[in-house]
């Protein structure tokens, strides 16, 4: 805290400039208008200011605004935003785009801070959902923002928004994520052809269900073996040996190098033998000539 | 570990020149704000002036038109040409090395300048 005292004669700031970098900290607290600091917050952020000069700065904002400040100051806030609570933040209403990307832009380069993460919430709870321009500039400054929602907040996402994922913004999703991710992206994409449709559904894949790889299965989409080791392991348990081929095309012969991980070794387990020496691979561990298969599961079902 | 190490302070008559010099290691400079500050006897540290990472400089009013401070990226160095000196530029000068995104900044050693006949 700056202690209080008078502004030494002819010191008195009639705008925000760069002669205030040589104000010490007392000085700008007493000769700085917080509403004159305000109107001008534009300038700041073209001031030099020592980071300790920014703190003098932030508390007469605080004190103009107690109940947090409007959006007019926000937008402008600059290395201003750094210095910022989570409890700060919480009192803003910020409703436009360009007031978030300009707050980001500040912390760009860095990881998700506190502040930003809590800016983000406020922003899109005032939305009420994560709209496509929104989740553009998210995933543009945070590419691992979407994995960072809980499915509960993952289901406001509407399926136009999904037009903006990239590959890499799925990467550190989990099963659970991609659960509620996958529909979306499946509607979102109904519209386009087979092979057009396989690259950009391929990063959702890992959330779909069985009936849905059967289907890519009949449409030649060559699936990498990177995707597939994605997919969920009971989504992938019930596909036969032929399916599989289909699925992967040339990329079958990966199955060796994995036969060890799962998906492909509990899928392994499940299949005849004689199937699995089909693929000329290789590949062990498959279920030995002359042996019935119960599928427990389904006899549960049915009594 | 970061040092900021400066060089270049003296005794020097009234009309005369000095160049101090700040000298860095463990950070890379070009990054920084860099700033020079000045002390007097019983006096606060007062700015003198300053550098910005993308080169534009500012100076006190004292001192417009005698100091300039320039930087070296290559050498991680910044300097202080001093002209035209006067017995009231005699202090201790610091150099300083700040980022706006960051509490933490890092001072020289500070260096003797003393300007008498």
């Known amino acids: 805290e700056v202690e209080k005292t008078a502004c030494p004669s002819g010191k008195k700031a009639r705008e925000i400039d760069e002669s205030l970098i040589f104000y010490k900290k007392w000085e700008l607290e007493a000769c700085v208008d917080a509403a004159l600091l305000a109107t001008q917050m534009d300038r700041v952020n073209a001031i030099p200011f020592t980071y300790e000069q920014l703190d003098v700065l932030k508390h007469k904002l605080d004190e103009l605004y107690p109940q947090g400040y409007p959006e007019s100051v926000i937008q402008h806030l600059g290395y201003l935003f750094l210095k910022m609570s989570p409890e700060d933040i919480r009192k803003w209403n910020v409703t436009s785009l360009e007031t978030l990307k300009a707050l980001l832009e500040v912390n760009k380069g860095h990881e998700m801070s506190p502040q930003v993460a809590t800016l983000i919430d406020r922003f899109v709870k005032g939305r009420g959902q994560l709209d496509k321009d929104t989740l553009d500039t998210l995933t543009a400054f945070y590419p691992g923002y979407l994995c960072s929602l809980s499915p509960e907040e993952l289901s406001s996402v509407p399926p136009s928004s999904i037009w903006a994922v990239r590959p890499q913004d799925l990467d550190t999703c989990d099963p659970r994520q991609l659960d509620v991710l996958y529909p979306k992206a499946r509607l979102a994409f109904q519209n386009m052809n087979g092979s057009e449709y396989f690259v950009k559904i391929q990063s959702f894949l890992g959330g779909a269900p069985t009936e849905d790889l059967k289907a890519l299965s009949q449409q030649n989409v060559s699936m990498d073996l990177a995707t597939f080791m994605k997919l969920r392991t009971d989504a992938v348990l019930p596909l036969t040996v032929a399916e599989v081929q289909k699925l992967l095309g040339p990329h079958v012969e990966g199955l060796k190098a994995e036969e060890r991980h799962r998906p492909v070794r509990d899928w392994i387990l499940r299949q005849r033998q004689d199937d699995l020496d089909t693929l000329g691979l290789g590949l062990q561990g498959g279920i030995p000539n002359g042996y019935l298969v119960l599928d427990l599961s389904m006899q549960e079902a049915l009594s | 570990q970061v040092q900021l190490v400066q060089s270049g302070g003296g005794l020097v008559h009234p009309g005369g020149s000095l160049r101090l010099s700040c000298a860095a290691s463990?950070?890379?400079?070009?990054?920084?704000?860099m700033r020079w500050y000045r002390q007097a006897p019983g006096k606060e540290r007062d700015l003198v002036a300053l550098i910005t990472d993308d080169g534009t400089s500012y100076y006190e009013d004292s001192v417009k038109g005698r100091f300039t401070i320039t930087r070296d990226n290559p050498s991680n160095k910044v300097f202080l040409q001093m002209n035209s000196l006067k017995p009231e530029d005699t202090a201790v000068y610091y150099c300083?090395?700040?980022?706006?995104?960051?509490?933490?900044?890092?001072w020289g050693q500070g260096t003797q300048v003393t300007v008498s006949t």
């Open positions: 463990g950070i890379d400079l070009s990054l920084y704000r």
């Open positions: 300083n090395a700040e980022t706006p995104l960051s509490p933490v900044n890092y």
